[in-house]
């Protein structure tokens, strides 16, 4: 911790400027008034402070604002933002998208950090929901950041906002997040024609249930293998060989390449080998011909 000393009169600080870079850690702690620092935070980012000096400045602000910094300070944190822990950020109340933009710019190259994820979470809480302006800001300044939000936070996205989400914004989303976003996307795009609907819904399909995947197989969508591989395992397993063939169209040949990877591997294990053979791809591992399949889970449910 920084030792307390008294400030020499000639070192007294009346404004935040570049002369401070020559102050030792102890002098900075003793001579910089936290209230002055907070009032002139907009100057800090243009001054080449050392990492050690930034630690002192953070310490000063922490002492002045033990309950969390005001947004007027947060907006101008600059490099100091990257010294904040998620615990620090959780104390903040952030409602301005200008603040979010400023800190996302500082975090470029660090978009998936815990700091950024916590900041976005605070913005969503502060604004009450994940509205279109917030989504637009995230997609513009932080592609992929949408997926840093918890499923609970994503549930506050109105379906009307889904159209602003681009495929690359969903690249890092996990199954639980797509489970939340898919029904909203389905609702948002429900009035579109078949081909247009598929283009729009495709990035969200990692959250689609079996019945919706089956429905798509009837629409000649020619799903690409990358999208198929992102489908939920539970959604793929009940599909028949004929349904998968119709779903993938000309891309069905790609199953051979993905034969050892889930969900393809698990799906193959569920199919009859003679059905797989009809694809002519040499897929192996299906249920041998003549074997009877007993679904014990059904029997357990009945007993």
């Amino acid at each position: 911790d920084v030792e307390r000393t008294t400030c020499p009169p000639e070192k007294e600080v009346h404004e935040i400027d570049e002369s401070l870079i020559f102050y030792k850690k102890r002098e900075l702690e003793a001579c910089v008034d936290a209230a002055l620092l907070a009032a002139q935070m907009d100057r800090v980012d243009a001054i080449p402070f050392t990492y050690e000096q930034l630690d002192v400045l953070k310490h000063k602000l922490d002492e002045l604002y033990p309950q969390g910094y005001p947004e007027s300070v947060i907006r101008h944190l600059g490099h100091l933002f990257l010294k904040m822990s998620p615990e620090d950020i959780r104390k903040w109340n952030v409602t301005s998208l200008e603040t979010l933009k400023a800190l996302l710019k500082v975090s470029k190259g660090h978009e998936m950090s815990a700091q950024v994820a916590t900041l976005i979470d605070r913005v969503v809480v502060g604004r009450g929901q994940l509205d279109k302006d917030t989504v637009d800001t995230l997609t513009a300044f932080c592609p992929g950041c949408l997926c840093s939000l918890s499923p609970e936070r994503l549930s506050s996205v109105p379906p009307s906002v889904i159209g602003a989400v681009r495929p690359q914004d969903l690249d890092t989303c996990g199954p639980r997040q797509l489970d939340v976003l898919y029904p909203k996307a389905r609702l948002a795009f429900q009035n579109m024609s078949g081909s247009e609907y598929f283009v729009k819904i495709r990035p969200f399909l990692g959250g689609a249930p079996t019945e919706d995947v089956k429905a798509l197989s009837q629409q000649n969508v020619s799903m690409d293998l990358a999208t198929f591989m992102k489908l939920r395992r539970e959604a793929v397993l009940p599909l028949t060989v004929a349904e998968v063939q119709k779903l993938l169209g000309p891309h069905v040949e790609g199953l051979k390449v993905e034969e050892q990877h889930s969900p393809v591997r698990d799906w193959i294990l569920k199919q009859r080998q003679d059905d797989l053979d009809t694809l002519g791809l040499g897929l192996q591992g299906g249920i041998p011909n003549g074997y009877l399949i007993l679904d014990l889970s059904v029997r357990e449910a009945l007993s």
Partner: antibody, heavy 119, light 107 residues
Framework: QVQLVESGGGVVQPGRSLRLSCAAS????????MNWVRQAPGKGLEWVAV????????YYADSVKGRFTISRDNSKNTLYLQMNSLRAEDTAVYYC????????????WGQGTLVTVSS | DIQMTQSPSTLSASVGDRVTITCRAS??????LAWYQQKPGKAPKLLIY???SLESGVPSRFSGSGSGTEFTLTISNLQPDDFATFYC?????????FGQGTKVEIK
């Protein structure tokens, strides 16, 4: 006086891993940021990665992102570069260098260690 | 990432000459630019930081200028010890990037 000494270089096959170290002395290691910079034979300097004084922030060049990991042990005054999935184009002299803050240049450099990726 | 472009890539000069090397950034980097000198088989050495500040111990014949996207390194009275390769580097973004280098050789 400030001294940075790299070690761990050598010949390695493509796809394999290597860990470089940089031993620091003559300054308060835990106060300063540390970088790795490399130079392929007969080529220019290429910045590889930086780690902040407390290890809280790390940044990488696109060419090594996902393959290389920069880390530090402040109790041992040592910087590391874990290099995985090595490629022929990673062949270079690797230098460690110090910076004192986000807006500071690289003021002290080690003498470098040669990494050769070849089958 | 910010791209740094140096020119010329090679420069032939004589002892006593005034030499100028240019460095251009793909976007504004304010004054956060450094110049380094490297001799064969040696580590780079910091000459200039913050576009125009001379690093301690560096001879005053070296000077730097510029801001935003255009920068220059000038050696006012080239000495035998100055024949080397010079690099610019931006440190405005956390992903620091170097120029491709300028080799100053004897004419």
């Amino acid at each position: 006086q400030v001294q940075l000494v790299e070690s761990g270089g050598g010949v390695v096959q493509p796809g394999r891993s290597l860990r470089l170290s940089c031993a620091a002395s003559g300054f308060t290691f835990s106060s300063d940021g540390m970088n790795w910079v490399r130079q392929a034979p007969g080529k220019g300097l290429e910045w590889v990665a930086v780690i902040w004084n407390d290890g809280s922030n790390k940044y990488y060049a696109d060419s090594v992102k996902g393959r290389f990991t920069i880390s530090r042990d402040n109790s041992k005054n040592t910087l590391y570069l874990q290099m995985n999935s090595l490629r022929a184009e990673d062949t270079a002299v690797y230098y460690c260098a110090r910076d004192r803050g986000p807006l500071w240049p690289l003021d002290y450099w080690g003498q470098g260690t040669l990494v050769t990726v070849s089958s | 990432d910010i791209q740094m472009t140096q020119s010329p890539s090679t420069l032939s000069a004589s002892v006593g000459d005034r030499v100028t090397i240019t460095c251009r950034a793909s976007q504004s980097i304010s004054r956060w630019l450094a110049w380094y000198q490297q001799k064969p088989g040696k580590a780079p050495k910091l000459l200039i930081y913050k576009a125009s500040s001379l690093e301690s111990g560096v001879p005053s014949r070296f000077s730097g200028s510029g801001s935003g996207t255009e920068f220059t390194l000038t050696i006012s009275n080239l000495q035998p010890d100055d024949f080397a390769t010079f690099y610019c580097q931006q440190y405005n973004s956390y992903s620091r990037t170097f120029g491709q280098g300028t080799k100053v050789e004897i004419k």
